[in-house]
Interface confidence: low
């Protein structure tokens, strides 16, 4: 708290301007009218105030707006945003994407701070869903943003927003997150032709079910091994040798290098050895010829 003291004669601020940088903290408190500050917030960013002086300015705004700042003030906070606590931000009602962009710009180049996380949370909750423009903005500032959301939060992402997602935005997503995002991507890209569709859906395939992989195998997509290795094991296991061959196209030769790794290793265990032999890759570990498979789900091969 800054002690209440009278403003010295002739020091009352009529404008928010550079002369204020020479004011002591108590003079700023006494001589700057909070309402004036609120209407001229856009000037604060251009003035090299010290952190201590910014503390005083924040204190004045807090007194003027105890229930939370109006958006007209928030949009022009600039570096004063860095002084806000998550508790302060929870009082705000930010609805304009321009306001969001302005505040994210202040934090640009830094990791997502608790303040930014709270701001984004307030903004998204205010909008009711993570629309395309918002997602576009957030992933531009924080490529890993999408994967920082819980599966529950991702469920509020409308399929139309998926168009804003770039492959690198999904780099750190775990399987549970891709399980939520994949059906949305499938819906978003459903009207594209085969090859274009595959280019767009590829990054999301870690959440794809078996039937979709079977469908892709009929479309000459030539999936690369890196994508194949990220597929859900339970989705890969039911695929036949012929389906995997069609799915991978010329990349099928890469299976040999991956034969000891999931999901390839587990898939091999489910295939007949004579089917595997048709690939000519020397893959070993399939069900011996002449064995009768009674229960594939148990991965048991009995004679």
């Amino acid at each position: 708290e800054v002690e209440k003291t009278a403003c010295p004669s002739g020091k009352k601020a009529r404008e928010i301007d550079e002369s204020l940088i020479f004011y002591k903290k108590w003079e700023l408190e006494a001589c700057v009218d909070a309402a004036l500050l609120a209407t001229q917030m856009d000037r604060v960013n251009a003035i090299p105030f010290t952190y201590e002086q910014l503390d005083v300015l924040k204190h004045k705004l807090d007194e003027l707006y105890p229930q939370g700042y109006p958006e007209s003030v928030i949009q022009h906070l600039g570096y004063l945003f860095l002084k806000m606590s998550p508790e302060d931000i929870r009082k705000w009602n930010v609805t304009s994407l321009e306001t969001l962009k302005a505040l994210l710009e202040v934090n640009k180049g830094h990791e997502m701070s608790p303040q930014v996380a709270t701001l984004i949370d307030r903004f998204v909750k205010g909008r009711g869903q993570l629309d395309k423009d918002t997602l576009d903005t957030l992933t531009a500032f924080y490529p890993g943003y999408l994967c920082s959301l819980s599966p529950e939060e991702l469920s509020s992402v409308p399929p139309s927003s998926i168009w804003a997602v770039r492959p690198q935005d999904l780099d750190t997503c775990d399987p549970r997150q891709l399980d939520v995002l994949y059906p949305k991507a499938r819906l978003a890209f459903q009207n594209m032709n085969g090859s274009e569709y595959f280019v767009k859906i590829q990054s999301f395939l870690g959440g794809a079910p078996t039937e979709d992989l079977k469908a892709l195998s009929q479309q000459n997509v030539s999936m690369d091994l890196a994508t194949f290795m990220k597929l859900r094991t339970d989705a890969v296991l039911p695929l036949t040798v012929a389906e995997v061959q069609k799915l991978l196209g010329p990349h099928v030769e890469g299976l040999k290098a991956e034969e000891r790794h999931r999901p390839v290793r587990d898939w091999i265990l489910r295939q007949r050895q004579d089917d595997l032999d048709t690939l000519g890759l020397g893959l070993q570990g399939g069900i011996p010829n002449g064995y009768l498979v009674l229960d594939l789900s148990m991965q048991e091969a009995l004679s």
Epitope: M112, A117, G144, C147, S148, S150, P151, E152, T172, C173, D174, P175, R176, Q177, D179, M229, K230, R232, T233, R260, H261, R262, R265
Partner: antibody
Framework: QEQLEESGGDLVQPEGSLTLTCKAS?????????ICWVRQAPGKGLEWIGC????????WSASWVNGRFTISRSTSLGTVDLKMTSLTAADTATYFC??????????????WGPGTLVTVSS | AYDMTQTPASVSAAVGGTVTIKCQAS??????LAWYQQKPGQPPKLLIY???TLAPGVSSRFKGSGSGTEFTLTISGVECADAATYYC????????????FGGGTGVVV
């Protein structure tokens, strides 16, 4: 029997670097697992550092790590290393490695190593 | 961020009594919660995963419950061997996380 064992713990100077190794034995390292590092300062609680997938290049780490710690793996050696740089006294702890089976059922660490002590002091 | 808050920090129990430890997540983590027991000089031991599933070889005196943000570990018929520190751990996500573990609860018997 499946086992994890950490090694490399030592007394190290502030601002120094150190690499810890987690060796997996009796464990098919080409299978799908996450090997994770967790530390515990003397008399304090458990603190998650990060995890590395034994096959894919996926690495996830706690937000406080900030690039100071790097997790790498060698499939042929069956090891996962934790390379620590710019060490401070606050990094003094017992460092454990633990295994999480790679599935869709959440993270939990069924198998732990005994731990290795790192002391940062001049 | 997903922060885990454990209460109480320590608790005393008589042999044969019951101990209840609570764990609160700052956001919903569904049922992705594990409980561990740790004794001095030893690594943690998994007791319960997915909020209520008992790990192999763990006594049925340990019971986990809860979902969403509120979870409970109950130890009934407390024995001397139960004296240890107990930790909860969220297994929901590893993205944008400071620590997956709660602060721990010391149990004195």
């Amino acid at each position: 029997q499946e086992q994890l064992e950490e090694s490399g713990g030592d007394l190290v100077q502030p601002e120094g670097s150190l690499t810890l190794t987690c060796k997996a034995s009796g464990l098919d390292f080409s299978s799908s697992y996450w090997i994770c590092w967790v530390r515990q300062a003397p008399g304090k609680g458990l603190e998650w550092i990060g995890c590395r997938h034994t096959f894919t290049a996926n690495t996830w780490s706690a937000s406080w790590v900030n690039g100071r710690f790097t997790i790498s793996r060698s499939t042929s050696l069956g090891t996962v290393d934790l390379k620590m740089t710019s060490l401070t006294a606050a990094d003094t702890a017992t460092y454990f490695c633990a295994r999480d089976e790679s599935n869709n059922d959440g993270w939990d660490f069924k198998l732990w190593g005994p731990g290795t002590l790192v002391t940062v002091s001049s | 961020a997903y922060d885990m808050t454990q209460t109480p920090a320590s608790v005393s129990a008589a042999v044969g009594g019951t101990v209840t430890i609570k764990c609160q997540a700052s956001q919903s983590i569904s049922n992705y919660l594990a409980w561990y027991q740790q004794k001095p000089g030893q690594p943690p031991k998994l007791l319960i995963y997915q909020a209520s599933t008992l790990a192999p070889g763990v006594s049925s005196r340990f019971k986990g419950s809860g979902s969403g943000t509120e979870f409970t570990l109950t130890i009934s018929g407390v024995e001397c061997a139960d004296a240890a520190t107990y930790y909860c751990q969220q297994g929901y996500t590893s993205s944008n996380v400071e620590n997956v573990f709660g602060g721990g609860t010391g149990v004195v018997v």
